[in-house]
Structure formats: structure tokens, C-alpha cells
């Protein structure tokens, strides 16, 4: 009652291996690191036969094929290329994942190489079974922003793609009778998150009141450059708005607030995000330039009160931009309580100007980001949100304009975006 | 075309409480806020408040806080506005209005012992 | 609070003249960013609810006649009717929203 000698599948083993096998002896099919038991269209890791009582096995040799892990899954804002030859899914071929560059980069800089494992699982070194993550990458437009010294009010021109996180805001409050309309800027923080300022996104008619305007009275548009033709921007409206909960209507201190997207919006040559920068509450140091763009009023011939009086748009049509010295605390304090009036710069603010005035922001430009660049990371950084400026007209000699010190505000920036009250689960670059 | 119609004339004694009632057609009431003045003989005109009925937000006068408390019922586009501690300074007109526009028809409130 | 000054506090015209009446605030109703004075103007007559005229200071409400005209930005506002109709015999209040809302004391018109 002898079975008939066993020969092992190829890239597999019989155990145990005996020259004689008798009635009731069992044997243990496996395969090699790499290869499963196919049997009957069905996979497994060992399969085990019997010799029976008239001398025949109770089932054939299975044979012993190769792991695949299958077509590796997509990756959000990435692509996958295989580095085996015909695109090869088995055991031990590669694939590598990469972001789409230069508009996003792999969190935790690892290699995007992953190897098909024996489990029949793509498996990175460091990242094991999970796919990488590819985030915005902030702070480096696609032109470099030039050296030039240019001015919002009296300014020449931006350049499409200077400021890619520029957001300009429109609100239309329809709950008063009539609408109030009003615009502002913002800055792109990630694909869903844009960055501004609190009194942008209160209701106007009250004014010492803080009513966040509704959600849906807010659009957003990223990626303007020419406020005449919006044909090329994407316009998103908001799921959420968040103000600052202490912002304080008499003295805009912590003018500071958030605006959700209803969807995320596709990053490109003209829409990127902007950096935060690091929690500390030096804020940006005296001298250091920054730049502000906006689409706020550009003619400097043209005081404040007579483009409100005259009804015209405050808009400039084409985006302005202006470069900035950051002005010390102790001076910028000095000039305002030189003033009449109760003007109060708080540590929650910075000043930027020239002490001869020329160059400034102005109304319009309210909840843009003023950035500067870090030399350490390369990027450009969200020091500061347009606030306010004194009674005199923008850029008067003197009158620095005031912004919000963004720095104090990372921990709180940090905490509302990855909220559970946040629309969705978004990764943030931090 | 946009109106509000307020509940009828009310005589109350010191000390009660009083709910009045705006309810409005002709246009999405949860959008629009609501407002709420008192008209007294030689008086003029006060401000008591306002509420946005989609979102219940409120905003009162100060004079009128303790005094005034706002709700809205969207279901049946009413507006109410309660009146508590009566006493006979609180006897006048009371207008619902439509942020700046429509007003309402007006309640008498009578506050005598 | 914003305090609104109304004068005169009465005037008598005969029909068809033109009347002007003032409106001062306590400070300013121009809103810069919307570019709008908070100021409306309303009518209200004998036994009935007031009646929006103008808002904006200067904007005329769908259907009021064109006699009736809103003037002034910052802190001083006049209603001006070009000329004075039996049916504008009414009591004029103006109203601030720029912020927690107050009325002027009110001009009432009377024709001779």
C-alpha cells in the first residue's frame, strides 16, 4: 500500500521527505518566499495530501505560483511608475510613487519606492502597507517674485502667478435690506483653507457688533489676476466662517479668521498656498521687507472719501503689490499715540511702511497676507494679515499700516483646521 | 408682494408678561433678519432689536436686554417677541420690520392695573 | 449710541412748494468698506406704520415718487420734496444702522 514517490512543485517543497510513503502518511505542500499554493483557482499558504488505502495520494501536487500584489492603488495629487520591466506587479518587483510636482511634495521625504512583499502587499521601508501623502507645497510660486520696489497705492502691475495664494473675497450680505456688498483679500493656506482677516467677514451693518457674515453669502475667488475677467480663476463658495472668538470690533485685535472651501480647489501655476510660519510671538523683526498684494485702491491721487463718496469701484483691476519694511513696535505705538483718537497696537500686531510715506497698503486690500521670505526654508511665509491704518489718507507720511501678528495664531490656525467641526478630514502642511 | 402681519391688540396688568407676534409672507424669512421698534406718544421711535430667524442670532439695545427676548419659528414664518415684568412704561406700539424695509401692521400693548 | 437730531421739529407749507428737512448724526454713517452712509428716511401717517422712503441716504425705494429726494453723506442728511402733495401730510424719521439702530426725533409736516 505504497504511495507513488512525490516530486515537489517548482519554487516549492513536500514535507516531510521520506523515500517510502504507506497508507495514512501526510505530506505538507508549501512554496517558496514568494509563491503561494494554487490550487482549484484557489490560493493558499500550504496545502496537504494523503497517501490512501489503495495506494494513490488524495490529491495531486498543487503548483506553487508567484505573489502579485495587483495594480498598485492610485495616489491623491500623485503617479505611481513601475521600475520592473513590463510593468511587472509579482514579488519583488518596484514601483515607485511620486507628487505632482512642483505644485505638491511627499510628507516625511521618503522615496516613494515600494516593493511587492511575499504577503502580496506593496510595502515601503519606512511607511510599510500605508501609500505616501502628497501635500501642498507653500510659499514658492511658480515665478520668482522679483526684487522690485513696487506700490499698491500708485503701483504698477503684478504678474499673473506672483501671488498664487492671493484669494479675492466677496461677500454680499443679502440677510439686510438692501444687500451690503464688499470685498476683501485672503491667502490660500491649503487646498480648502483660506486665511484673512476678521472684520472682513462681519457683517457691516452693525458696527460695534461682531456678526460673522453667513457662509453663504461669502465667495472666494484663487488664481485672478484681473478682477474684469474672472474666466480663469476658480470661484469656490464657503462651508464654513470662522472668526477669531475674541476679535475685538473697537481696537481689531485679533483680526484674525478662516474661511473653509466647499471643495478643495486644484493647485497650480496660479494657485498655491501660502506658509505659516512658526509659533512665536516676536512676530517678523524690525527692517525685515515683506510684500502685500491686493486689489484695493492704486490711485494715489485719489483720496479715500472720494472713492467712497463717488460710488466708483475701490477696486484696482489688476492686481498691485508693494514691498514693505516691518516698523519696531515701540515706533509704530509712538506714531499712534501721537494721534487723535484711541488707537491701541497691540502685541497681536505689527507695523510695516516707510516713515516718509509714499507706500502702503490700502482699503480694499483688507485680510491679504503680508509675506516675507525665509531664507532657512526657502519659502515665503504669512507673517502678517492686512488689518487697519490711521485717519489720514494711505501712505501719509508717518502712518504705518497695521497688520495681524499671524505668528500668534499658528496654535489656534492649526487647531480650527483639523477640528472635527472641519467639513472634512484635511491634511494640512504643518 | 412682502408683508408682516402682527397679532392683535393686547391689555396687560404689571408685573405679567406679554408674547407678540410678526408673521411674515412674501419672501424666504429665514433669510432676512427681523426687527423690532416701540413707538410711545412723544417718545418717538426706539430700536428694541433684531433676530435672523434661519440662524436664531440676535442683537438687542441695551436698554431692552431683561426686557425683550426674541425667537422665530421658521415652520410657520413667525417672529415673537416676549415682554417680560411689565410695568406701564411698556405701554405703546410695538413694529415688527424687515431689516430696513417692511414694516409691520403693529401691537398695541397696554400695561394698566 | 449714535444720537440723531431732526429739525425742525414741525413746519407748515402749502402744497406744491418744496421743503427740505435736516438729519445730523452724532458721528459718521459712511462705511467705508461697502461705501454706503447707513441713513434711511421714513414716512409714516396718521394711524398708520412707518413707510421706507430713501435708504442710503440717497437711494429713492421702488415706488416712492421722485419728489422725494435723500441728500448728505457723514453726519449730515437733508430729505428734500420738491413739491409737497396734499398726501405727504406724515410725520419723516430718520434712522441710522451704521449701528445699534436709532431714529431721529421726527419732522412733521403739516400743509396749510
Known amino acids: 500500500n505504497e504511495c507513488p514517490k512525490l516530486q515537489p512543485p517548482v519554487y516549492g517543497k513536500i514535507e516531510p521527505s521520506q523515500a517510502v510513503y504507506s497508507f495514512k502518511d501526510q505530506v505538507l505542500v508549501s512554496c517558496d518566499t514568494g509563491y503561494k499554493v494554487l490550487k482549484d483557482n484557489g490560493v493558499m499558504d500550504t496545502f496537504q495530501i494523503e497517501c490512501l488505502k489503495d495506494g494513490a495520494w488524495s490529491n495531486k501536487i498543487p503548483t506553487c505560483k508567484i505573489v502579485d500584489c495587483g495594480a498598485p492603488a492610485g495616489l491623491k495629487h500623485g503617479l505611481v511608475t513601475f521600475s520592473t520591466r513590463n510593468n511587472l506587479t509579482t514579488y519583488k518587483s518596484e514601483i515607485r510613487y511620486s507628487c505632482q510636482q512642483p505644485y505638491y511634495k511627499m510628507l516625511h521625504n521618503t522615496t516613494g519606492v515600494y516593493t511587492c512583499s511575499a504577503h502580496g502587499t506593496w510595502t515601503n521601508e519606512v511607511l510599510k502597507r500605508s501609500l505616501p501623502t502628497c501635500l501642498p507645497v507653500c510659499g514658492q510660486p511658480s515665478r520668482a517674485l522679483p526684487n522690485l520696489v513696487k506700490r499698491i497705492i500708485g503701483g504698477r502691475n503684478a504678474e499673473l502667478g506672483l501671488f498664487p495664494w492671493q484669494a479675492l473675497i466677496v461677500v454680499e450680505d443679502t440677510s439686510r435690506v438692501p444687500n451690503d456688498k464688499w470685498f476683501g483679500s485672503g491667502a490660500l493656506l491649503s487646498e480648502s483653507w483660506i486665511l484673512t482677516a476678521a472684520h472682513v467677514l462681519r457683517s457691516q451693518r452693525r458696527d460695534n457688533t461682531v456678526i460673522p457674515v453667513s457662509k453663504e453669502h461669502v465667495t472666494v475667488y484663487l488664481g485672478l489676476h484681473d478682477v474684469r475677467d474672472k474666466s480663469g480663476a476658480v470661484n469656490s463658495s464657503a462651508a464654513r466662517v470662522i472668526l477669531h472668538p475674541d476679535f475685538n470690533i473697537q481696537n481689531y485685535n485679533h483680526d484674525i479668521a478662516l474661511v473653509q472651501l466647499q471643495k478643495p480647489v486644484p493647485l497650480g501655476a496660479h494657485v498655491m498656498p501660502i506658509c505659516l510660519p512658526r509659533p512665536e510671538p516676536e512676530g517678523p523683526a524690525p527692517h525685515m521687507l515683506g510684500l502685500v498684494a491686493g486689489w484695493g485702491i492704486s490711485n494715489p491721487n485719489v483720496t479715500v472719501d472720494e472713492i467712497i463718496l463717488s460710488g466708483t469701484r475701490t477696486l484696482s483691476d489688476v492686481l498691485q503689490y508693494v514691498k514693505l519694511p516691518v516698523v519696531s513696535h515701540a515706533e509704530c505705538k509712538a506714531s499712534y499715540e501721537s494721534r487723535s483718537g484711541n488707537y491701541s497696537v497691540t502685541e497681536n500686531m505689527f507695523c510695516a511702511g516707510y516713515y516718509e510715506g509714499g507706500k502702503d497698503t490700502c482699503l480694499g486690500d483688507s485680510g491679504g497676507a503680508f509675506v516675507i521670505f525665509d531664507e532657512m526654508s526657502q519659502h515665503w511665509v504669512a507673517q502678517g494679515l492686512v488689518s487697519w491704518g490711521g485717519p489720514e489718507e494711505c501712505g501719509s507720511k508717518q502712518v504705518y499700516g497695521v497688520y495681524t501678528k499671524v505668528s500668534n495664531y499658528v496654535d489656534w490656525l492649526w487647531e480650527e483646521m483639523n477640528s472635527p467641526r472641519a467639513v472634512r478630514d484635511l491634511q494640512v502642511e504643518r | 408682494q412682502v408683508q408682516l402681519k402682527q397679532s392683535g391688540a393686547e391689555l396687560m396688568k404689571p408685573g405679567a408678561s406679554v408674547k407678540l407676534s410678526c408673521k411674515a409672507t412674501g419672501y424666504t424669512f429665514t433669510g432676512k433678519w427681523i426687527e423690532w421698534v416701540k413707538q410711545r406718544p412723544g417718545h418717538g421711535l426706539e430700536w428694541i432689536g433684531e433676530i435672523l430667524p434661519g440662524t436664531g442670532s440676535t442683537n438687542y439695545n441695551e436698554k431692552f436686554k431683561g426686557k425683550a427676548t426674541f425667537t422665530a419659528d421658521s415652520s410657520s414664518n413667525t417672529a415673537y417677541m416676549q415682554l417680560s415684568s411689565l410695568t406701564t412704561e411698556d405701554s405703546a406700539m410695538y413694529y415688527c420690520l424687515r431689516s430696513e424695509d417692511v414694516w409691520g401692521t403693529g401691537t398695541t400693548v397696554t400695561v394698566s392695573s | 449710541d449714535i444720537v440723531m437730531t431732526q429739525s425742525p421739529s414741525s413746519l407748515a407749507v402749502s402744497a406744491g412748494e418744496k421743503v427740505t428737512m435736516s438729519c445730523k448724526s452724532s458721528?459718521?454713517?459712511?462705511?467705508?468698506?461697502?461705501?454706503?452712509?447707513?441713513l434711511a428716511w421714513y414716512q409714516q401717517k396718521p394711524g398708520q406704520s412707518p413707510k421706507l422712503l430713501i435708504y442710503w441716504a440717497s437711494t429713492r425705494e421702488s415706488g416712492v415718487p421722485d419728489r422725494f429726494t435723500g441728500s448728505g453723506s457723514g453726519t449730515d442728511f437733508t430729505l428734500t420734496i420738491s413739491s409737497v402733495q396734499a398726501e405727504d401730510l406724515a410725520v419723516y424719521y430718520c434712522k441710522q444702522s451704521y449701528n445699534i439702530p436709532t431714529f431721529g426725533g421726527g419732522t412733521k409736516l403739516e400743509i396749510k
Open positions: 458721528q459718521s454713517l459712511l462705511n467705508s468698506r461697502t461705501r454706503k452712509n447707513y
